[in-house]
Interface confidence: low
Amino acid sequence: GCALGGAETCEDCLLIGPQCAWCAQENFTRPSGVGERCDTPANLLAKGCQLNFIENPVSQVEILKNKPLSVGRQKNSSDIVQIAPQSLILKLRPGGAQTLQVHVRQTEDYPVDLYYLMDLSASMDDDLNTIKELGSRLSKEMSKLTSNFRLGFGSFVEKPVSPFVKTTPEEIANPCSSIPYFCLPTFGFKHILPLTNDAERFNEIVKNQKISANIDTPEGGFDAIMQAAVCKEKIGWRNDSLHLLVFVSDADSHFGMDSKLAGIVIPNDGLCHLDSKNEYSMSTVLEYPTIGQLIDKLVQNNVLLIFAVTQEQVHLYENYAKLIPGATVGLLQKDSGNILQLIISAYEELRSEVELEVLGDTEGLNLSFTAICNNGTFFQHQKKCSHMKVGDTASFNVTVNIPNCERRSRHIIIKPVGLGDALELLVSPECNCDCQKEVEVNSSKCHHGNGSFQCGVCACHPGHMGPRCECGEDMLSTDSCKEAPDHPSCSGRGDCYCGQCICHLSPYGNIYGPYCQCDNFSCVRHKGLLCGDNGDCDCGECVCRSGWTGEYCNCTTSTDSCVSEDGVLCSGRGDCVCGKCVCANPGASGPTCERCPTCGDPCNSKRSCIECHLSAAGQAREECVDKCKLAGATISEEEDFSKDGSVSCSLQGENECLITFLITTDNEGKSIIHSISEKDCPKPPNIP
């Protein structure tokens, strides 16, 4: 909780959690109770802090720019708005989350720039033949989807260095000389046709292309992708259009440090290096780009990659596409016969998805997304909507929180993959207290100016301490705060101010005593309850409430439950301990020691029952039952019984006989008489 966080300043208090507030009201607490100023706003109000003195900054969203989403066709593509809002400031209280809603709508008839990047290694000869009319066919199909379509063309083979190419003069001039066939010298990347709406020009360019060759199977296509993405002006990418890069190949691609084989060790710099002939001039100088570098530049330039690759390569490029935002893979027939349908399908797939990406200074920031897609369906922890129709709106709840109070603001961009539109977000921490602006330096409230007064408390100058800086260094001896010289100051549970202990607050109860040596929570427990819940804990000992006694206060002093029916405590056969009889007499039992078959003279008390039993014959024995009941006994004829704990009796009968029997006790404490017999009876007179 806020109050237990030990905050001594307003800023420390706000850092404990978003639920905490600080009371800057003067004289709000006892001088030592600085920590009491930090609590929930409700608790501070309840404690008497006036509302205008409660420092409790809240997270807030300030929208700077929120143009409505474009609906229908726009005359000017620069007027198109596909994300709303476009700019906002988020003031966040550390630990407190703020949710904002972002809406994305792919506008109808959005301009499309498509750059056709083709592998021109020898195996692509048949493909080159197939696509000679692709420009006009593609323009015709795309005109059904957009009224503003442009096409461009570039080609690639491989870095023209050993061991990727053969280096004899003959094979450098004609890498196909061993076939024999004429093909162009190996090249890295050539940008041939900037983006244009002239489809016939595209056809013409394609017809003029010649294949080239290299040795190993992987090609240098990633070098070409990097140049096509970053050479924005030369390629002709427009600001307000969908940028599609169609990568056509039948082989894998080299990346990263593969070029070390050729002694090329300078990392790719991600910059445009097209010379005056629009050829990649650093092909033999810079390493292939890494996948990470490609991702950065494709995202930065809003380029959506369509891998059109043959069957053997599909799996490989699917793995690359998983890593590259917005990338798709299409299966290319051996001769590129299905390239048109592949491009149209990929375009439709891209247009049916809206996915957000986050760029900028996000480290340590907690961002979570919920996508709200078709028909308002919520997808938690997702930032992508699929199966959308162009013109549909996708919404996203974005929840942001910062864990702690950093001193900087962060700039973040949330944008749909492949679109230029973005939401710019400035996240700034909200942790300052307004009361900190009003500082009374050398304040008289701080004992003759020994400190500065702000936010209701004193910040003491060096050499002074105490709630009002009233304690100088000469008064800082802690000896009077120690119970014994080797004991910690204030028992380690308080602060020594000017020779006196001010005990800490504790979540468990009160700490008190001149040395904070006492508390009301460190006593013994009975059944998990402090002092059995029948007493108060005072400095480690239970002080029992009225009616209770014992170390644990679990012993009642009442004797009511010990009094037997005859009004005698424990029937006079035991002691009343903790409200229960502890029977002292052997054989005594029962809640009040009322059962005791062996008490008094057990044998003689059964005489009337025994004699009746012996003198009666047959049916007359029934008459004895009442006599036996009065004597608290029953007679058993059973011979098989336990003799443990039995009492053996001998009585002189009326006829001078010796009567012997045994008494046992049943579970209810009643007497049972066994083995009755008469002995030594006098013989009757011998009368003839």
Partner: antibody, heavy 124, light 108 residues
């Protein structure tokens, strides 16, 4: 003078449960002033906090071990115990029990009393 | 969790020299909840400093602690032979409690 003594098997088989007990002598385990703590140290490495228990039974565990660790207290025996399930060779370490002053307020003390430690090896 | 980073990893000094050990927290912590411990081979750690600057019982005054916020320092003004050991800082202001990785002070 409070003293702590760890006890338990020195060898535990992989996938089994490691069980250690710490006995408190010379002072009360039922004081409201202390957290009773377990810490371990892998061979040649630094110290890793496992968790603590308050005499009332409330606990706090290291998130990295939370799913496998249980700390319990028996105030009548003045003991607190550590159970670590599904152990692997990575749990081989010296295990210490220690006493810590409470978290809130200016209970400055930190881990002021330590046991001498017990070595536990996890091996089949 | 709060990450504590100690530097240097090893400090090679001669007896009589001054040792300065640093402990940096990944986020602001209250100095009330920072401690320093000394550990010698085969022994349990021994408390030296609590509350960033208060010496534990029986600790000689050549050991002193200072710092606040994210930067804390343990200073040994004149190294004695028995001071060569590993020193750890620890925060106990929030769970999980965390230790620094340790600084070894060895004889040069």
């Amino acid at each position: 003078q409070v003293q702590l003594q760890e006890s338990g098997p020195g060898l535990v088989k992989p996938s089994q449960t490691l069980s250690l007990t710490c006995t408190v002598s010379g002072g009360s385990i039922s004081s409201g002033v202390y957290y009773w703590t377990w810490i371990r140290q892998h061979p040649g490495n630094g110290l890793e906090w496992i968790g603590y228990i308050y005499y009332s039974g409330s606990t706090s565990y290291n998130p990295s071990l939370k799913s496998r660790v249980t700390i319990s207290v028996d105030t009548s025996k003045k003991q607190f115990s550590l159970n670590l399930t599904s152990v692997t060779a990575a749990d081989t370490a010296v295990y210490y029990c220690a006493r810590e002053g409470p978290l809130r307020g200016d209970y400055y003390y930190g881990l002021d009393v330590w046991g001498q430690g017990t070595t536990v090896t996890v091996s089949s | 969790e709060i990450v504590l980073t100690q530097s240097p990893g090893t400090l090679s000094l001669s007896p009589g020299e001054r040792a300065t050990l640093s402990c940096r927290a990944g986020q602001t912590i209250s100095s009330r909840y920072l401690a320093w411990y000394q550990q010698k081979p085969g022994q349990a750690p021994r408390p030296l400093i609590y509350g960033a600057s208060s010496r534990a019982t029986g600790i000689p005054d050549r050991f002193s602690g200072s710092g606040s916020g994210t930067d804390f320092t343990l200073t040994i003004s004149r190294l004695e032979p028995e001071d060569f050991a590993v020193y750890y800082c620890q925060q106990y202001g929030s769970s999980p409690r965390t230790f620094g990785q340790g600084t070894k002070v060895e004889i040069k």
